[in-house]
């Protein structure tokens, strides 16, 4: 039986009965939030062999091993992942081993096993036999291996039953539990699976099979399953479905969407039966099962029941993610927020058309409206009193509407109104009139020349750069000395710079009035000598990286007591010089014969220039005869220091660790202080953990159904 579209077992362990007849779970399997410790021994699901998406276990009290629950789980396909992971075991307080002794393949995605205070038998599993790449696995904060004393079957009796492989230069036995070895196929099978008797399966089998070289005897399929056979591709008039099987058109047409009862049904595209057309495509008509390419971004019509959608937070903006046409009116009222400009762009940046009016009021957090980066048409089908379809009132920090050199926006009907926007230059408004085609519609009172822009440097002279010099991590720039009408009014300069892979940045990118700014800022004092041109050395830059730089003069000058006179430069794009690349990543070597090594690696994370070649060096090493790190005579004699709490703190050092020669003299030494790079790596690691945990909580904690 195929179960799906995803099974979520929570709160009550008896819900596990839903898995009773499942051979394949088409979708994910969540087992989580069972806080009462139960006896799971009576629950066993030997039929389950494949999960097509991912397996997530979180806070299931009393569960000590997965081996009894899922003795025959062979493949987790990872067709869809949970935050890049196909197997997540998180905060399982009583889990002692994973025990999935028949798990042979995780087709896509990595594993994350974290904060499981009692979990052992992690270092005895060779994940490289199950996954293609182990570099993204995250196994942290479990019971320390030293406290586990993981013994594979037969080791105590000195009749080891399991095979050995090398992990991190340690050649050791591989097993899942004290009585279950990790299955390995003979090297003659190559990439193929094998039977329990070590006979090679058919190339189309994945994980295991019940008979050798037979594409109808596979436990799971490497590519696709169709009518009892594993096939490399779906036959004519059938379509790939959920990444693992072939279905016909009728089957695809009759699938009900799990997400919504009123959805338009599944579509067939590029030989696949899928819930929605992929990115860049749209249905060829509302009842169609086929997709056609979109011209530009695909339209997604969003409608507001109450006609007017108020955007007063990131959360309210989130509802508009992906929308290209908004049927209704937008009222933007963002008084505060964190990183608001980029968040709003993320959620509202695809909107192209608003059918009603747009009103921006009291949005003191906004510096620019460029977050509506694709808005091209305001229809004005509904207007505010006074026939306004674009209304901008009392936005204390609004400085830019859009970058009109790269923006076409049409206001089909209705007028514009601007008042009490003290940092918005009136010339910016008049430019909008011309671009939007509303010139002549506004009355004098609609654009208040007194209270718009009265606190901005709307009269701006241009600062010109005079020289630029670069090295691998520095840029030196100088510019003409600016001379305002009254020289005493020039206070200083501010240099703004940031990485800019493309020459398309604007002054207001990522900027809001609450402190978020994608630009780095440096203040530059006036040179004391009036003949010296001002300049700055920007250091600590990345090699072979393009930066955008501009300069603003900070002045006091007022024009007729109501407008500040200022000066700024154009945006300059400048690239630092190339440098030595960082080390190549994920170096792996394997021997495929007695005289050959195959070495693989990934490019460096920081090429610092255009890579032209790699240098590979090798040398012969003496054989390491020390193959056992621990020699346990008895499992009972393992010294247990303390119960692991599942946190990821660094162990406290209670005495000076004895180390070798330090500072030229023998004797006890303190561990060397961490380098900046190590500290940064630790910081990033901690951040990454937080992000994952937030993702996990946000994904699994849902309101109770009404």
């Amino acid at each position: 039986e195929i179960c799906g579209p995803g099974i979520d077992i929570r709160n009550d362990y008896q819900q596990l009965k839903r898995l009773e007849n499942c051979t394949v779970i088409e979708g994910y399997l969540h087992i989580l939030l069972i806080s009462k410790a139960e006896d799971y021994r009576s629950y066993r699901f030997p039929k389950l062999t494949v999960i097509t998406e991912y397996l997530l276990l979180f806070r299931v009290a009393g569960l000590e091993s997965l081996g009894d629950l899922f003795p025959n789980l062979t493949v987790i396909r990872g067709w869809k992942l949970f935050y890049n992971y196909a197997l997540v075991i998180f905060e399982m307080t009583n889990l002692k081993d994973i025990g999935l002794y028949n798990l042979r393949n995780i087709t896509r995605g990595a594993i994350r096993i974290e904060k499981n205070a009692d979990l052992c038998y992690l270092s005895t599993v060779d994940w490289s036999l199950i996954l293609d790449a182990v570099s993204n696995n995250y196994i942290v904060g479990n019971k320390p291996p030293k406290e586990c004393g993981d013994l594979c079957p037969g080791t105590m009796e000195e009749k080891p039953m399991c095979e050995k492989t090398t992990i991190n230069n340690e050649y050791n036995y591989r097993c899942w539990t004290t009585n279950r070895c990790q299955k390995m196929c003979p090297s003659t099978c190559g990439k193929r699976a094998c039977t329990e008797n070590n006979e090679c399966c058919h190339p189309e089998c994945l994980g295991s099979c019940s008979a050798p070289d037979n594409d109808t005897a596979c436990v799971a399929c490497r590519h696709y399953y169709y009518a009892g056979v594993c096939v490399p591709a779906c036959p004519p008039n059938t379509y790939r479905f959920e990444g693992w099987r072939c279905v016909d058109r009728d089957f695809c047409a009759n699938i009900l969407s799990a997400e919504s009862s009123d959805s338009e049904g599944f579509v067939i595209h590029d030989g696949e039966c899928m819930q929605e057309c992929p990115s860049g495509f749209i249905r060829n008509g509302s009842q169609s099962m086929y997709c056609i390419p979109c011209e530009g971004p695909c339209p997604k019509v969003c409608e507001e029941e109450k006609k007017t959608k108020t955007i007063d937070s990131v959360t309210s903006a989130q509802m508009l993610q992906g929308c290209t046409i908004f049927k209704g009116n937008l009222l933007i009222n963002i008084r505060r927020g964190n990183n608001i400009a980029s968040e709003l762009e993320n959620f509202m940046g695809l909107i192209e058309v608003v059918t009603g009016y747009v009103k921006i009021r009291h949005s003191h957090a906004l510096v620019s409206l460029s977050f509506l980066k694709n808005l091209r048409l305001i229809l004005g089908e509904e207007q505010l009193e006074g026939n306004y379809s674009f209304y901008v009132l009392d936005n204390q920090n609004l400085q830019q509407l859009w970058d009109w050199d790269h923006r076409n926006l049409t206001i089909k009907a209705g007028k514009m109104y601007f008042a009490f926007n003290p940092k918005l230059c009136v010339s910016e408004i008049y430019r909008m009139e011309e671009v939007t085609g509303t010139k002549g519609r506004q009355s004098k009172g609609d654009i208040n020349t007194r209270n718009n822009g009265e606190r901005a440097s709307c009269e701006s002279d241009v600062l010109h750069f005079t020289s630029t010099t670069t090295s691998k991590n520095r840029i030196i720039i100088t510019w003409h000395r600016y001379r305002p009408p009254d020289y005493r009014d020039l206070i200083s300069f501010t240099v703004y710079y940031k990485e800019a892979p493309f020459k398309n940045v604007t002054e207001y990118d990522g900027q809001d009035a609450c402190g978020s700014n994608s630009w780095n800022m440096v203040d530059v004092d006036l040179p004391p000598n009036k003949d010296v041109e001002p300049g700055i050395l920007l250091h600590g830059l990345k090699p072979w990286t393009q930066y955008a730089v501009y300069v603003k003069a900070v002045t006091l000058t007022m024009v007729e007591n109501d407008h500040i006179r200022g000066a700024k430069s154009e945006i300059l794009y400048i690239r630092t010089n190339a440098s030595v690349p960082s080390i190549p990543l994920d170096v792996l070597s394997a021997s495929n014969s007695s005289s050959q090594l195959i070495v693989k690696w990934n490019p460096p994370s920081l090429p610092n220039g255009n890579l032209s070649y790699y240098i590979v060096r090798w040398q012969r090493q003496p054989q390491d005869g020390y193959l056992y790190r621990h020699n346990y005579c008895s499992k009972d004699k393992i010294p247990i220091r303390k119960y692991a709490d599942g946190t990821i703190d660094i162990e406290e050092v209670t005495e000076n660790p004895k180390t070798e020669v330090c500072g030229g003299e023998k004797g006890p030494c303190c561990a060397c202080p961490k380098t900046e790079a190590e500290k940064q790596a630790e910081k990033e690691e901690a951040e990454y953990r937080k992000v994952f945990e937030n993702f996990l909580h946000n994904s699994i904690f849902v309101p109770r159904p009404e």
Partner: antibody, heavy 117, light 112 residues
Framework: QVQLQQWGPGLVKPSGTLSLTCAVS?????????WSWVRQPPGKGLEWIGE???????NYNPSLESRVTISVDKSKNQFSLKLSSVTAADTAVYYC??????????WGQGTTVTVSS | DVVMTQSPLSLPVTPGEPASISCRSS???????????LDWYLQKPGQSPQLLIY???NRASGVPDRFSGSGSGTDFTLKISRVEAEDVGVYYC?????????FGGGTKVEIK
Amino acid sequence: QVQLQQWGPGLVKPSGTLSLTCAVSGGSISSSNWWSWVRQPPGKGLEWIGEIYHSGSTNYNPSLESRVTISVDKSKNQFSLKLSSVTAADTAVYYCARDRYYGMDVWGQGTTVTVSS
Amino acid sequence: DVVMTQSPLSLPVTPGEPASISCRSSQSLLHSNGYNYLDWYLQKPGQSPQLLIYLGSNRASGVPDRFSGSGSGTDFTLKISRVEAEDVGVYYCMQALQTPLTFGGGTKVEIK
């Protein structure tokens, strides 16, 4: 105190182009005001010709739009009027003025332009 | 275009007496912000016009308080509480609500 000083030829031939310039002193043309041109035919009332903002944005009287060009020169702190294809009907006193949000509060001294061959 | 109509065409006055000029627009000059976009100007003989009243009822700087403006929408009035000899000239109303800006035909105030 802002003052407007205007100048230009007093006599223009029919079908020729009338050119007048207005210089702003005591303030900046880049302040947030519109700079207007108004004319008054002999013995008649005032007629608004058009206006310019320092950014270059303009508004013209539709009755004259096809013939009129108003421009600004920020470096010289002045703005200009050009009226092409003039006829005797364009004979008038031409005034430049500062149009604040609160009315036209500063006016030039006026230039009498006669269109005659 | 907004048409502005002034009356009377000519207004003979006695110094020390009050005077009143009316101005009517072909459409409302009241903006949704609450202001009436109507200005009053005086052009003394041989001089450039000068601003008296802006936004319907606000006296421009340096204008004596004997001048006052009132009205809303389409009907406006300029009052001089006690006319002085220096007040002679042509008074113009102008709508500043939308372009093209338009002037009334003018009212000539002269001493009797």
